[in-house]
Structure formats: C-alpha cells, structure tokens
Interface confidence: low
C-alpha cells in the first residue's frame, strides 16, 4: 500500500488504479477510518457519503476537506476493460503545522549555581503532537535531570483535536561563563518538513545574592478592619533574583498568581483568617513570614489587636 500524508482541512483525491474511463458497477471503495465502524463500502451508484467523500466520474475518491477522523485505510477495487481486477490501497495520515513556537516568560537574567527557569516554549495547533526541543548556542540541549531539566506538557483541544505543547527549561548555569543563547524548535516528525524555530533569547548570568529577612506588612495596622474596608498585605524580602511570593490563608495556599502584594478590597467575614506569605528562592528554599490574623469587626471594640502575633498591635511582622 501507499502512505499518503495530507494537511488537515485540505482536499484529498485518491485515484483508483485500473478504473475504466466510464466506471460501471465494477468499482468500489472501502474505507476504514475514524468516521466508520469497521469498513464502509462506497460505490459510484451510491449517494455521496455525508459530503465527506464521493466517487468522481473517473473513479477517484474525493475527500473535500480532510480531518483527523479521516485518518485510516482506503481501498479501491476495480475491474479494467480486460476483465482484470486491480486493487489500490492507501494508508492516510493527516497533519497540521502549528503556529510558530514562542518562548513565553523568557528569563532576562539567570543566577549562577542555582536552578533557573529559562522560559517556556509553547507550540499551539499541531497534529500529530510533534516534539519541542531546546538548543544552547545552536546545539541541541540534552536534559540530564540535574543541571538541565525539561518539563513537558501536552494537551489536546477537546473539539479540534489539535495539540498544544509546552516545554519548560530549567538550567543551572556555571559561574563566570559566557552569555548563553537559548532557542527552541518544533518538529512534526514528518519527512520533508523542516523544524520551526523560535527567536533566540540571551539571558545574562549573574552571581547569586542570599535573601534577607522576610516582612509581612499589614495595612491597617493590627489587621482589624470594619466590614467594607480594605486590607493590604505586603510581603517584603530582599533577594536577587527576586523570589516568587505566594500567599497562604488558614494553612492553605491561595490559588493566586505570585505577587508580593495581597489586596483584600471591601472585606467581609469571608476574608477573616490567618494569612502568611511564602517567598520561594531557588538557592535558599522557601521562607515563610510570621502569620497575621485578619479580623473583620462590626463594633471597633477589639481589646488586643487581633492582627498581630504578639498582640502589640504592630502592623509589621519581621522574621
């Protein structure tokens, strides 16, 4: 049989070898694809099959716009003028070239001797899934699980069936090295299809600075607020590169994007709880602030300041 590769959405015509110029009953196509249950038989006299495929006057099979579900096996059997039976057999695969891959959240600088996220390479809309690979100074970068770590994710769109690939590169650069150039390429793995390359990125490498103490600043002071008021929690830490700040409420991480500031506008009792922030620094591990208890009060008659750990009413909590 013959292997055919066709681009999704485009027409595909499969010729029936040995078909007479004016086909008679003696021609049939059999299809076994994602659209069919086992084999589907088509003949020139039959109706076009749901606008998906139809037999042309010359006996060829036309699929006007091929899709993923049309992948499969196509067989034609025809009897020529001499009464000899001729068979044609096709194995059809479809493909879709994605948009040009890009590196999202590229690092502008890396810290020596610690793991750094270089960026995430994203390719959207491929079929089959294909592969993403990273390059350092134009040469393939082989993940070793230590100094070079690649975390890959493949998702399939529930409706289109096309794939989105994500590849996150983490490296541990050495001190005193040259400025590295990273790039990423997507390959479908099909013959005669060249890889698609991203624009290169050139993060600079700098020496690490250890983090200093972490502070949780509370506004209003003490963390006690009237309903409808605003509470601002600010996590302050000095480190290079700046760590990611996540927030914890009642012992549970809040599902928010990392940010050094947590704003609670128009607070109600649902905002009450024990808050702390966690600074994650690759070379020094996570650092958690002292917690603060946020209380919403109707009366303003509080006794001790509920927001401070020691009851002194101080709004600044330092480690």
């Amino acid at each position: 049989g013959q292997n055919i590769t066709a681009r999704i959405g485009e027409p595909l015509m499969l010729s029936c070898k040995g078909a007479p110029k004016k086909p008679t009953q003696k021609l049939e196509w059999k299809l076994n694809t994602g659209r069919t249950e086992a084999w589907k038989v088509l003949s020139p006299q039959g109706d076009p099959w749901d606008s998906v495929a139809r037999i042309l006057p010359n006996g060829s099979l036309l699929l006007p716009a091929i899709g993923i579900v049309d992948e499969g096996t196509f067989r034609c059997r025809a009897t020529n003028r001499l009464g000899k039976e001729v068979k044609s057999n096709y194995r059809v695969r479809v493909y879709q070239i994605p948009g040009k891959p890009e590196i999202v959240n590229p690092a502008s600088e890396l810290t020596a001797n610690v793991p750094n996220k270089v960026g995430t390479c994203v390719s959207e809309g491929s079929y089959p899934a294909g592969t993403l690979s990273w390059h350092l100074d134009g040469k393939p970068l082989i993940p070793d699980g230590k100094g070079t770590v690649v975390k890959e994710e493949t998702r399939r769109h529930p409706e289109t069936g096309l794939f989105t690939l994500r590849s996150e590169l983490t490296v541990t650069p050495a001190q005193g090295g040259t400025t590295p150039t990273y790039s990423c390429s997507f390959s479908l793995g099909l013959p005669r299809r060249r890889p698609l390359n991203t624009a290169p990125i050139q993060p600079r490498v700098r020496e690490p600075l250890p983090p200093e103490g972490i502070q949780l600043l509370v506004e209003p002071e003490g963390g006690t607020v009237a309903p409808g008021g605003t509470v601002t929690l600010t996590c302050a830490i000095s480190a290079q590169p700046p760590p990611q700040i996540h927030w914890i409420k009642d012992g549970t991480p809040l599902p928010l994007a990392p940010s050094p500031v947590l704003l609670l506008p128009e607070v109600g009792h649902e905002d009450e709880g024990i808050y702390s922030c966690v600074a994650t620094h690759p070379s020094h591990g996570p650092q958690e602030s002292p917690p603060v208890n946020i209380r919403v009060t109707e009366t303003g008659d509080e006794g001790q300041a509920a927001g401070s750990v020691d009851g002194s009413g101080l709004g600044t909590l330092a480690l």
Partner: antibody
Framework: DVQLQESGPDLVKPSQSLSLTCTVT?????????WHWIRQFPGNKLEWMGY???????NYNPSLKSRISITRDTSKNQFFLQLNSVTTEDTATYYC????????WGQGTLVTVSA | DIVLTQSPASLAVSLGQRATISCRAS??????????MHWYQQKPGQPPKLLIY???NLESGVPARFSGSGSGTDFTLNIHPVEEEDAATYYC????????FGGGTKLEIK
C-alpha cells in the same frame, strides 16, 4: 453568623459506604477557607479526615486516602463526605468544620457501624 | 505525619490554682517566629471550641485566664485562675503539613 450542620444516617452496615452532608449557612463555601471533616472516636481521640478547598481542590488524611472522597454542591452550599468499605472501627462522631484553625464546627453526628 | 503528644493525660487542680497542659510535636510546626498550633476545649456532648490560635493568640470571647505559649515543637496551655466551668478535655492541634490533634488532657476541678 457562620453555622455548620451535619446530616446523614446514624447506622451503617460494615463494608458499605458512609455518606454525610454538611450544610453551611452564613458563608459561601466558594468564597474562602477550607472545609473539613473531623471525627471523634468513642475513646475521644480526634482524627482529621480531609478537606475541600474553596477552589474545589481536596486533601485527605493519608491513612484514609484509598477510602475517602469529599465533594461539594455549591448551589446548595453543602459539602459531602463519603467513606467506603467501613468497618466497626469507623464508628465515631463526625464533625464538619471551617478553616485552618477550626473556629467553627457543626454539632456532630454519631455514626455507628454495625451489622 | 507530625505526631502531637499531650501531657498529662488527666489533671486535677484546685479552684483558683494554675493548670498547665503541655503539647510536644514530633517536628516543628511553624516558622522561627510563630507556630501553627491551636488549643481547644471540649465539654461532653459538644464540639471542640477554639481557645488559642497560632500558639499564643486568644480567640475572641475566650476569658483572659487562658493563655498559650511555646514555639517550634513545645507548647503550653495555661489556665489561671482555674474556675469550675473549666472542667473539660483540652486538645492541641496543628495546621502544618495537613492536620493532627493531640490525645487530649482531661481537667478536673478539685
């Protein structure tokens, strides 16, 4: 004021599933906090079972992980406990509670596992 | 799992005296500055009631004769002066790496 109320059968046969409901009033379970199930055995030992976070994620006591499921119905402001393959050792008072420091609890419901 | 060990298991204190209950964690339950340790009081037929949160903070509505202290792995609940209504079982609980409770201390008033 926040109130929690447990409900469900008070008698379950061994090997069956125990299902309890916690109805929360005065606060939306999708607004904040984690919502927990805790049980207290006849000897008064307290055991944390698991929680459902307001985001919908769950976390379970490792000793129960293979048997426990906590789900919710946000339209009714309820969350649920299902404990499978119960034995007589699952006889306890089951409480639902709110948050990391458990400032709010239900009154508890005694569930007896017996043939 | 972090294991919490409470001592003593039971305690009899005269009216007006001090009651001290200890709770030891198998590993640290907080930062160097504060700890995710909480104390509860439970009376028969009732759910536990929060007394102290974050090791030393008094829950609103709880009398000032209750106090909590400690950090890292060792924590203490003090009641002074003890009153008759304080007869109950007291539990420590942490909210670090999931949650566990201590075994409880039964306080009896002499």
């Amino acid at each position: 004021d926040v109130q929690l109320q447990e409900s469900g059968p008070d008698l379950v046969k061994p090997s069956q599933s125990l299902s309890l409901t916690c109805t929360v009033t005065g606060y939306s379970i999708t607004s904040g906090y984690s919502w927990h199930w805790i049980r207290q055995f006849p000897g008064n030992k307290l055991e944390w079972m698991g929680y459902i976070h307001y985001s919908g994620s769950t976390n379970y006591n490792p000793s129960l992980k293979s048997r426990i499921s906590i789900t919710r119905d946000t339209s009714k402001n309820q969350f649920f406990l299902q404990l499978n393959s119960v034995t007589t050792e699952d006889t306890a008072t089951y409480y639902c509670a709110r948050g990391g420091d458990f400032a709010y609890w239900g009154q508890g419901t005694l569930v007896t596992v017996s043939a | 799992d972090i294991v919490l060990t409470q001592s003593p298991a039971s305690l009899a204190v005269s009216l007006g005296q001090r009651a001290t209950i200890s709770c030891r964690a198998s590993k640290s339950v907080g930062t160097s500055d504060s700890s995710y340790m909480h104390w509860y009081q439970q009376k028969p037929g009732q759910p536990p009631k929060l007394l102290i949160y974050l090791a030393s903070n008094l829950e609103s509505g709880v009398p000032a004769r209750f106090s909590g202290s400690g950090s890292g792995t060792d924590f203490t609940l003090n009641i002074h002066p003890v009153e008759e209504e304080d007869a109950a079982t007291y539990y420590c609980q942490h909210s670090r790496e999931l949650y566990t409770f201590g075994g409880g201390t039964k306080l009896e008033i002499k």
